[in-house]
């Protein structure tokens, strides 16, 4: 079948990094500068991605693979293949329409990206607040108030802080 296909379509013999040039009797021609073909049998080469402005080149384009970009310091990637660069904020802030803004009371962000999330409500788990939350840190929940009553034989060690889920990007 492969041999038949080759006889029918000479372009199938053109390897990655080349294209089947209709203008030259379907000869396999190398991809021109700043273009690539990642698979064989291509009739055109794709234009290489250019990393401009806040995007910087992580991997140069080659004749067989596209360039890859990431973001300059102070920005981070969003989207598949780093299709966007978003400005960092400080911990304890979130990026809004008006720029980096401090987290409202009762919320926190321990990263330079993402949104401010509510502090854990310790009472929902029947626990008490061991360490207060801040703009940068979630509260730490401790033993339940009953465990701390006088005469309790032992104090249970504080529960580890709940790992906050990452905010959707």
């Amino acid at each position: 079948f492969e041999r038949t296909r080759s006889l029918q379509d000479p372009c199938s013999n053109c390897p990655a990094g080349t294209f089947c040039d209709n203008n030259r009797n379907q000869i396999c021609s190398p991809c021109p500068p700043n273009s690539f073909s990642s698979a064989g049998g291509q009739r055109t080469c794709d234009i290489c991605r250019q990393c401009k402005g806040v995007f910087r080149t992580r991997k140069e384009c080659s004749s067989t693979s596209n360039a890859e970009c990431d973001c300059t310091p102070g920005f981070h990637c969003l989207g598949a293949g780093c299709s966007m660069c978003e400005q960092d904020c400080k911990q304890g802030q979130e990026l809004t329409k008006k720029g980096c803004k401090d987290c409202c009371f009762g919320t926190f962000n321990d990263q330079k990206r993402g949104i401010c999330r509510p502090w854990t409500n310790c009472s929902l788990d029947g626990k008490s607040v061991l360490v207060n939350g801040t703009k940068e840190r979630d509260v730490v929940c401790g033993p339940s108030p009953a465990d701390l009553s006088p005469g309790a034989s032992s104090v249970t060690p504080p529960a580890p802080a709940r790992e906050p889920g990452h905010s959707p990007q």
Epitope: K52, F75, L78, C82, C85, Q87, L95, G99
Partner: nanobody, 122 residues
Framework: QVQLVESGGGLVQPGGSLRLSCAAS????????MSWARQAPGKGFEWVSG???????YYTESVKDRFTISRDNAKNSVYLQMNSLKPEDTAVYYC????????????????WGQGTQVTVSS
């Protein structure tokens, strides 16, 4: 093809003013949001200001009340009027399309100019 050409940079004393211009071509300017970014010596990029096609404007906190972004769709140009300049405003200023319409966010399809140097020094 898309071209963005900045001009108007230069050396200015603290407290002085400059007006940057960005001449755009190769795309439908009137329906495109535009932005300004800057890169200070040895530092990363910073999102400075943006303007929607309808004229709504946005600024980073450090330039609010000092910088004004505007556009002239008839001239395919966007401007950045910079007043009360400070030494920390020293940077290369870039004009860029702003397809995401999100503060501090650019996409891979956005286009960038080559930049114009602004130096604030006595």
């Amino acid at each position: 093809q898309v071209q963005l050409v900045e001009s108007g940079g230069g050396l200015v004393q603290p407290g002085g003013s400059l007006r940057l211009s960005c001449a755009a071509s190769g795309f439908t300017f009137s329906s495109s949001a535009m932005s300004w970014a800057r890169q200070a010596p040895g530092k990363g990029f910073e999102w400075v200001s943006g303007i929607y096609s309808g004229g709504s404007t946005y600024y980073t906190e450090s330039v609010k009340d000092r910088f004004t972004i505007s556009r002239d769709n008839a001239k395919n140009s966007v401007y950045l009027q910079m007043n009360s300049l400070k030494p920390e405003d020293t940077a290369v200023y870039y004009c860029a399309t702003w397809g995401t319409l999100r503060f501090g966010v650019w996409a891979e399809y956005d286009h960038w100019g080559q930049g114009t140097q602004v130096t604030v020094s006595s």
